[in-house]
C-alpha cells in the first residue's frame, strides 16, 4: 500500500564487479523520489542516496566494511516535494533487494596482462593485481589481497604462427611456462574462483603478444 | 542435481567420423571448463582436451589435435566430441567431466567407441 | 610435456591396513595434483585435489601429501570399498597428464 500517486521500486538488482557495487531499479520516476537502506543481516539500517530522482545507488563504501557478510538494501519511494508522505500504513513505500554477499557474488572484472618477460626458454608472465575498494589498515587492498588463494588465473597461450593453444594455472600472479627459442607467443589470462557456484569467471583479457610493448627478452 | 551424461558412442569403421555428445543439466556449462577423458579398453585415464563454452577456447593434448574438435552449445547446454579419421587405436570409453579449475567434480557414466572393420 | 609416474602399478593389501601410492612429476607442478579412485565399469570419482585437500564426501581416512614433484594418497585403514584403482592427475599445465594408476586388490 502507499499513497495513490507514488510506485514501489521493483527488479531491485545488484551490478557489482571487483567489490565496486551498485544497486539498480526501476522505474524510472515520475513525480516521486527515492531513498535506499542498507544494512547486514544483523545490523542496523544505514539510508544512502537521500530522495534520488536516480535509480541506482553506489552502496560501495557499505560493503566494502566486510565483503563477507550478506546484505540487504530496500528502496523507498516518496511523492516529490512531499517526502514526510506516508503510505496508508504510516511509512513509506517500499521494497526489498535479494540478498547479496560479495564475496562470493561480486563479478572478476576482466584481468590486464601487466608484462611478459622471456629468458630463453622460459616466459614469466604477469597478470595486474587489480586495487580494490576494499580497505585493510588505511589502505586499499588488491584483488589477491581479497581473495588469496581462493582466486586463480588461467593462462591461454599460443604460438602467434599457429591456432594450437596452451594453458597453464596459478594461484599467484605469476605464470612461468616454457616456450620454444626463437617463436613469438601470445597471451591471454581469465580469473576463476574454483570455489563459487555463480559468477566464477572473468571474461578473458586483452590478447598480448611478444614482440609488442609490453615484453621484455633476455638471452 | 548436477548430471552429466554421454551419448553417440557406438561401432564405426577405420576411417569413419563419430560425435559424441555430454548433455549437462544441474547447472550451466559455460560457468565450467568442460574435458574429455578417454579409457581404452583395460588401459588407464587418457586426457583428450577441454572447452571454456562460455569463450569457445579450447586446448587439446597435441596428439589430438589434428583429428578431434571440442566444441558447445550453451544453448543446449552440451558439449560436443568430435572425432574424425578413426582408428582402432581410438576404441575406448569417452567421459566427459566438469572442471571447476580445481579438480574434475563431476563424470558422466562413460560412452563406448568400438573402431573396427 | 608432464609425466606422471605412478607406483606401484598395483598392490595387494588387507582391510585395515595402511595403504600408500605415490606419483612422481617430471617436473615442479606446484600442489595442481588431484587423486581419483575408479572401480570397474564405473566414472572416475574425485579424493583429492590441490594435492592436501579432501573433497567433499570423502572418507577422511583418505590423505595426500607434496608439493613441486613428489606426491601421495595414503589410506590410512583399508576398507572393503577401497578396493579399487587410483589415478593421479596434474592439471597445472596442458596438456594434463594422468599416472597409470594404481590397482588395490585383496590379499
Known amino acids: 500500500s502507499g499513497t495513490t500517486n507514488t510506485v514501489a521500486a521493483y527488479n531491485l538488482t545488484w551490478k557489482s564487479t571487483n567489490f565496486k557495487t551498485i544497486l539498480e531499479w526501476e522505474p524510472k520516476p515520475v513525480n516521486q523520489v527515492y531513498t535506499v537502506q542498507i544494512s547486514t543481516k544483523s545490523g542496523d539500517w544505514k539510508s544512502k542516496c537521500f530522495y534520488t530522482t536516480d535509480t541506482e545507488c553506489d552502496l560501495t563504501d557499505e560493503i566494502v566494511k566486510d565483503v563477507k557478510q550478506t546484505y540487504l538494501a530496500r528502496v523507498f519511494s516518496y511523492p516529490a516535494g512531499n517526502v514526510e508522505s506516508t503510505g496508508s500504513a504510516g511509512e513509506p513505500l517500499y521494497e526489498n533487494s535479494p540478498e547479496f554477499t560479495p564475496y562470493l557474488e561480486t563479478n572478476l572484472g576482466q584481468p590486464t596482462i601487466q608484462s611478459f618477460e622471456q629468458v630463453g626458454t622460459k616466459v614469466n608472465v604477469t597478470v595486474e593485481d587489480e586495487r580494490t575498494l576494499v580497505r585493510r589498515n588505511n589502505t586499499f587492498l588488491s584483488l589477491r589481497d581479497v581473495f588469496g588463494k581462493d582466486l586463480i588465473y588461467t593462462l591461454y597461450y599460443w604460438k602467434s604462427s599457429s591456432s594450437g593453444k596452451k594453458t597453464a594455472k596459478t594461484n599467484t600472479n605469476e605464470f612461468l611456462i616454457d616456450v620454444d627459442k626463437g617463436e613469438n607467443y601470445c597471451f591471454s589470462v581469465q580469473a576463476v574462483i574454483p570455489s563459487r557456484t555463480v559468477n566464477r569467471k572473468s571474461t578473458d583479457s586483452p590478447v598480448e603478444c611478444m614482440g609488442q610493448e609490453k615484453g621484455e627478452f633476455r638471452e | 542435481e548436477v548430471q552429466l551424461v554421454e551419448s553417440g558412442g557406438g561401432l564405426v569403421q577405420p576411417g569413419g567420423s563419430l560425435r559424441l555428445s555430454c548433455a549437462a543439466s544441474g547447472f550451466n556449462i559455460k560457468d565450467y571448463y568442460m574435458h574429455w577423458v578417454r579409457q581404452a579398453p583395460g588401459k588407464g585415464l587418457e586426457w583428450v582436451g577441454w572447452?571454456?563454452?562460455?569463450?569457445?577456447?579450447?586446448i587439446y593434448d597435441p596428439k589430438f589435435q589434428d583429428r578431434f574438435t571440442i566444441s558447445a552449445d550453451t544453448s543446449k547446454n552440451t558439449a560436443y566430441l568430435q572425432m574424425n579419421s578413426l582408428r582402432a587405436e581410438d576404441t575406448a570409453v569417452y567421459y566427459c567431466?566438469?572442471?571447476?579449475?580445481?579438480?574434475?567434480?563431476?563424470w558422466g557414466q562413460g560412452t563406448l567407441v568400438t573402431v573396427s572393420s | 610435456d608432464i609425466q606422471m609416474t605412478q607406483s606401484p602399478s598395483s598392490l595387494s593389501a588387507s582391510v585395515g591396513d595402511r595403504v600408500t601410492i605415490t606419483c612422481k612429476a617430471s617436473r615442479d607442478i606446484k600442489s595442481y595434483l588431484s587423486w581419483y579412485q575408479q572401480k570397474p565399469g564405473k566414472a572416475p570419482k574425485l579424493l583429492i585435489y590441490y594435492a592436501t585437500s579432501l573433497a567433499d564426501g570423502v572418507p577422511s581416512r583418505f590423505s595426500g601429501s607434496g608439493s613441486g614433484t613428489d606426491f601421495t594418497l595414503t589410506i590410512s585403514s583399508l576398507q572393503p570399498e577401497d578396493f579399487a584403482t587410483y589415478y593421479c592427475l596434474q592439471d597445472g599445465e596442458s596438456p594434463f597428464t594422468f599416472g597409470q594408476g594404481t590397482k588395490v586388490e585383496i590379499k
Open positions: 572447452i571454456d563454452p562460455e569463450n569457445g577456447n579450447t
Open positions: 567431466a566438469r572442471d571447476t579449475a580445481a579438480y574434475f567434480d563431476y
